[in-house]
Interface confidence: low
């Protein structure tokens, strides 16, 4: 377990000409907070995917104006870093996503608007303990200046916080000094490497190296039974001369931490190691409530129904996720009908609609056919936003009006020859040939070769030709 | 400009009621946690309750655990504090303050008070 | 519940001193996943409303002069004003906020 710390320096213009426009205005004075997104590995994932290691949000920024038409300065910051802790091992290898968001506090009905400045991403690679390291990312024409770390959490230790658990040697609760393995609550930690030959069953260590005796047991290794008329310490373990301790009630005997925290003995009482999302004495609260503001992009917060559950954001159309980050694109639903173009504008979803057609979606076909009329006995077809006259046999063009030449197009086949016909066309086949078009040559013994029947079909069965 | 200006209070005799409002302007109301403090004729400082910026949420001490109620109206902008079995030692001036931010912030905003007595 | 005790009680001070008070916790107010001890020192003039001066143990809130310093973590605190001016005088409250909300009894600040 362990904590991933990240610490913004600076927000604002980066290095060179096209510098933005401050975001806040002394119309609309707003405040920056960060979302910080760690994934586990190098992988080019997606923004949307799941912050598998966790995320944070910032506290919000003092609140800026800036006076109009004046170029953006770096921005005021939020308080304190941004604190991503971790259950497990720290991976080593991850990737990051860091956003700026704006909270704009002018008199917007429903509360704050909030909007995404700049997001950067990155992959790293960082071992837990090591210094902070330092790094500029620029979006846009943005430029975030940050460093980051990760630490481990007592008593994890080395560069990927891991910690060893075994099974528990008593029922009721872990040796001296020893927490139990959340979630595992059926182990216990591993102590710690300690000095050779200290004894496995009544000796423990809190440091590399050293060796103190559990409750009975003395000696440089905890191998020499005491008597308990020895005892100097009311409880708890002893130095390893008097090696003994007489039991009595601890502190964290019940486990008073709620909500999964694991109990560690203080001098004065207790402490509760909370899991995320908990916090206070006992890890009896949650650590984030709708108070903080977690729903983004105007998403309605809701507290849970009793005091430990979790707040829940309802997002508003086109936005997802557990804390309405994600943008839906909603346009890949294919919303608008008869090849209407999508057009998603975040507020609200626009269609932009073919002639021919209307309506929020392109639902509405127009009469294309009214008022129009085909001549010489044509009729109106209507489709594709556009009328279109299907004419009489001997005329053609758009609306009927223009006589038609049946022969113009060469409809017949293998040279045969076209004769316009009150009725149509006729084509004389020339030798070899047959069909309304001439398009099947006659074999020599007479038979015409029709079209080959399908895979399956068998050649009787003509009306399923294809 | 935050404002916060605290009304209703008065004197009554143990065991009676009284509610107090708390009129917000000037900022997003509904974004913030807010709590009623009380100050003690000695000059001692007793927070009472407090409330989640939704509503959602109430935290007491429990010494007026079942008998104040908090609750907030975030359409009207106004906080309110329903106080009944009321005893002597509730006496004091009445403060509603506003949180930085959640429950868990220290409080940046607090009204003038408003008065509440209990005797018979 | 934890407690906060403030000392001293109260304190006579001539303009331009440097003061120090001190607030105790019952136990700790560092809160570990984030390294942030939940305690802020309030300033209470006569006649007035309490108003905030440091929240997290040591950010002074804007508008707060410079002057006031808040330190310490776990259970000791201090509020630091390095030349007091006599509108400092008032009486200065500590109060947690790591697990419901507590305030110390106050330390008076008066002139000498």
């Known amino acids: 377990a362990g904590v991933f710390e990240l610490q913004i320096h600076s927000f604002g213009p980066g290095p060179g000409p096209g510098a933005p426009r401050s975001p806040c205005s002394a119309r609309l004075p707003c405040r920056l907070f960060f979302r910080v997104c760690l994934k586990p590995g190098l992988s080019e994932e997606a923004a949307e995917s799941p912050c598998a290691l966790g995320a944070a949000l910032s506290a919000r920024g003092p609140v800026y104006t800036e006076q109009p038409g004046a170029p953006a300065p770096d921005l005021p910051l939020p308080d304190g870093l941004l604190q991503v802790p971790f259950r497990d091992a720290w991976p080593g290898t991850f990737s990051f996503i860091i956003e700026t968001w704006r909270e704009e506090l002018g008199d917007q009905i429903g509360g704050p608007a909030w909007s995404l400045l700049a997001r950067v991403a990155g992959r790293r690679r960082l071992a837990a303990g090591g210094p902070w390291a330092r790094d500029i990312q620029r979006a846009g024409a943005w430029e975030l200046r940050f460093s980051y770390r990760a630490r481990c959490e007592p008593p994890a230790v080395g560069t990927a916080c891991t910690r060893l658990c075994r099974p528990r040697s008593a029922p009721s609760r872990c040796g001296p000094g020893l927490r139990p393995c959340a979630p595992l609550e059926d182990e216990c930690e591993a102590p710690l490497v300690c000095r050779a030959g200290c004894s496995p069953e009544h000796g423990f260590c809190e440091q590399p190296g050293e060796c103190r005796c559990l409750e009975g047991w003395t000696g440089p290794l905890c191998t020499v039974p005491v008597s308990t008329s020895s005892c100097l310490s009311p409880r708890g373990p002893s130095s390893a001369t008097t090696g003994c301790l007489v039991p009595g009630p601890g502190p964290c005997d019940g486990n008073p931490c709620a909500n999964g925290g694991s109990c560690s003995e203080t001098p004065r009482s207790f402490e509760c190691t909370c899991p995320r999302g908990f916090y206070g004495l006992r890890c009896e609260v949650s650590g984030v409530t709708c108070a903080d503001g977690p729903c983004f992009n105007g998403g309605l917060c809701v507290g849970g129904a009793d005091p430990d559950s979790a707040y829940i954001c309802h997002c508003p159309p086109g936005f997802q996720g557990s804390n309405c980050e994600k943008r839906v694109d909603r346009c890949s639903l294919q919303p608008c009908r008869n090849g209407g173009l999508c057009l998603d504008l975040g507020h609200a979803l626009r269609c932009r609609c073919r002639a021919g057609f209307a309506g929020p979606r392109c639902e509405h076909d127009l009469d294309d056919c009214a008022g129009r009329a085909c001549a010489n006995g044509g009729t109106c077809v209507e489709g594709g936003g556009a009328h279109r006259c299907s004419c009489a046999l001997g005329f053609g063009g758009r609306d009927c009006r223009e006589r038609a030449d049946p022969c113009a197009a060469r409809p017949c086949a293998h040279g045969g020859r076209c004769y316009a016909h009150f009725s149509g066309l006729v084509c004389a086949c020339a030798p070899g040939y047959m069909g309304a078009r001439c398009e099947f040559p006659v074999h020599p013994d007479g038979a015409s070769a029709l079209p080959a029947a399908p895979p399956g079909l068998r050649p009787g069965d003509p009306q399923r030709y294809l | 400009e935050v404002q916060l200006v605290e009304s209703g209070g008065g004197l009554v005799k143990p065991g009676g009621s009284l509610k107090l409002s708390c009129a917000a302007s000037?900022?997003?109301?509904?974004?913030?946690?807010m709590s009623w403090v009380r100050q003690t004729p000695e000059k001692r400082l007793e927070w009472v309750a407090a409330i989640n910026s939704n509503g959602g949420r109430n935290y007491y001490p429990d010494t007026v655990k079942d008998r104040f109620t908090i609750s907030r109206d975030n359409a009207k902008n106004t906080l309110y504090l329903q106080m009944s079995s009321l005893r002597s030692e509730d006496t004091a001036l009445y403060y509603c303050?506003?949180?930085?931010?959640?429950?868990?912030?220290?409080?940046?905003?607090w009204g003038q008070g408003t008065s509440v007595t209990v005797s018979s | 519940d934890i407690v906060m005790s403030q000392s001293p009680s109260s304190l006579a001070v001539s303009v331009g001193e440097k003061v120090t008070m001190s607030c105790k916790s019952s136990q700790s107010l560092l809160y570990s996943s984030n390294q942030k001890n939940y305690l802020a020192w309030y300033q209470q003039k006569p006649g007035q409303s309490p108003k905030l001066l440091i929240y997290w143990a040591s950010t002074r809130e804007s508008g707060v002069p410079d002057r006031f310093t808040g330190s310490g973590s776990g259970t000791d605190f201090t509020l630091t004003i390095s030349s007091v001016k006599a509108e400092d005088l008032a009486v200065y409250y500590c109060?947690?906020?790591?697990?419901?909300?507590?305030f110390g009894a106050g330390t008076k600040l008066e002139l000498k």
């Open positions: 109060q947690q906020y790591y697990t419901y909300l507590t």
């Open positions: 000037g900022f997003t109301f509904s974004s913030y946690a």
């Open positions: 303050a506003r949180h930085r931010g959640g429950y868990y912030y220290a409080m940046d905003y």
